[in-house]
Interface confidence: low
């Protein structure tokens, strides 16, 4: 592989690494969305919530003169409850909505697939760099692109999940905004998907320059 190509691959791998860090951050944190009630009756406190793929946290926040609840960064009594994805017999204390649970299970499962693809891609990259097997960069690039797509699907499932929660008559929350974990997931998708495509492009053998050349005649990769 030529020096310029190697440099391009390294830059792409750095972008992919940033994508991996962002994807990991998004998966393990629970600030995908912040939900707040619109209190029609004057209360001294209100209950806002933020949630991720694995749990929902509610926080009792002091109310101001307006009817808005928050921001969630205000100090308050916090109570977190895990979505019990893997023990269907039990329902979560806070989350008793079956449709919502299905959404969070889907998003979490797809995120796990994404992490699986990231691991496979990283193994391919490590083997490629260690043993100079440049051809392994091609499957690695595909794995990263697939990981990015899985993150995108997770993001969309979470968007639907938030919409269902807000529209449901069985939650107190009416207003919402997407938070930093969601932004991390979106950025991870862009970096992994585009990085994967770029890596695929840079790791492919050089196309023949002349009509009489075949791919086999092209200069070797190393």
């Amino acid at each position: 592989m030529s020096q310029t190509k190697m440099l391009k691959v390294r830059v792409t791998l750095f972008c992919i690494l940033a994508g991996i860090v962002l994807a990991m951050t998004a998966v393990v944190t629970d600030h995908w969305a912040v939900l707040s009630p619109h209190m029609e009756h004057h209360n001294t406190t209100c209950e806002a919530a933020h949630f991720g793929l694995w749990r929902i946290c509610t926080k009792r926040i002091p109310m101001d003169d307006s009817k808005t609840c928050g921001p969630i960064t205000l100090p308050g009594e916090k109570n977190c409850s895990y979505f019990r994805h893997f023990n269907p017999g039990e329902s979560s204390e806070i989350f008793e909505f079956t449709t919502q649970k299905e959404y969070s299970i889907s998003a979490a499962a797809i995120a796990i697939f994404s992490l699986g693809f990231i691991i496979l891609g990283s193994l391919c990259v490590l083997l490629s760099l260690g043993k100079k097997r440049d051809y392994l960069l091609r499957p690695a690039s595909m794995f990263y692109a697939f990981a990015g797509l899985c993150i995108l699907v997770s993001v969309e499932v979470m968007r639907q999940s938030v919409k269902r929660m807000i529209d449901s008559e069985d939650t107190v929350w009416i207003e919402y905004y997407y938070s930093w974990s969601f932004a991390c997931a979106c950025a991870a998708f862009i970096l992994l998907f585009l990085g994967g495509l770029a890596l695929l492009l840079f790791s492919l053998p050089r196309m023949p320059r002349n009509p009489w050349e075949s791919c086999m005649d092209a200069e070797p990769e190393h």
Partner: antibody, heavy 125, light 110 residues
């Protein structure tokens, strides 16, 4: 199926008392605000009272404050309206309505999505 | 005396569009969600619109609502004979700490 069934209406004398009940079924009663609304003959709807899911917060219309008491027994899935010092103007059909979802810090809204069939209260000498 | 004012009556021929207004103040419509109820003669009221413009499942999309400042309106398009009813707007009122209904509008299909 979500259902509300009122009872306890009837004839009462001015200054007398009546206790209305509203039996709920088909939903998690303790998670919802409940309300009483009345309609005098040939007149429009008038909100009477509301109570939060836990029963801890109650609201009353100015016309009934101090005379009517709203309460609920979540174990029996029943809403009550104790009416004392009844007046002729309290004559109406009384409806109970299922309100918005309640969390520990407040209720979502008081739009009534399910109504009972109503019970008639007549206050006359 | 209701704090939400509605016209006493509205009418239209089948297929026509009818609009009902509801006027209030900052303490009710201006600062809270608005609801619309339909009461067909001899029946119990039914929630038609919640949270300003949302329709509960089962309510046809011929019914639509909007809110602007301290007033609101309910529109019925493609009027049918089955739409003959009394329509009430309602909202929470902060100053009264209570729920207030509009005066009601009787819709007649000619």
């Amino acid at each position: 199926e979500v259902q509300l069934l009122e009872s306890g209406g009837g004839l009462a004398q001015p200054g007398g008392s009546l206790r209305l009940s509203c039996a709920a079924s088909g939903f998690t009663f303790s998670s919802y605000a409940m309300s009483w609304v009345r309609q005098a003959p040939g007149k429009g709807l008038e909100w009477v009272s509301s109570v939060s899911g836990s029963g801890g917060t109650t609201y009353y219309a100015a016309s009934v404050k101090g005379r009517f008491t709203v309460s609920r027994d979540n174990s029996k899935k029943t809403l009550y309206l104790q009416m004392n010092s009844l007046r002729a103007e309290d004559t109406a059909v009384y409806y109970c309505g299922k309100g918005g979802y309640c969390s520990s810090s407040g209720c979502r809204h008081y739009g009534m999505d399910v109504w009972g069939q109503g019970t008639t209260v007549t206050v006359s000498a | 005396q209701s704090v939400l004012t509605q016209p006493p009556s509205a009418s239209g021929t089948p297929g026509q569009r009818v609009a009902i207004s509801c006027s209030g103040s900052n303490s009710n419509i201006g600062n809270n969600y608005l609801y619309w109820y339909q009461q067909i003669p001899g029946t119990t009221p039914k929630l038609l619109i919640y949270r300003n413009n949302q329709r509960p499942s089962g309510v046809p999309d011929r019914f639509s609502a909007s809110k602007s400042g301290t007033s609101a309106s309910l529109a019925i398009s493609g009027l049918r004979s089955g739409d003959e009813a009394d329509y009430y707007c309602a909202a929470w009122d902060d100053s009264l700490s209570g729920y207030v209904f509009g005066t009601g509008t009787k819709v007649t299909v000619l």
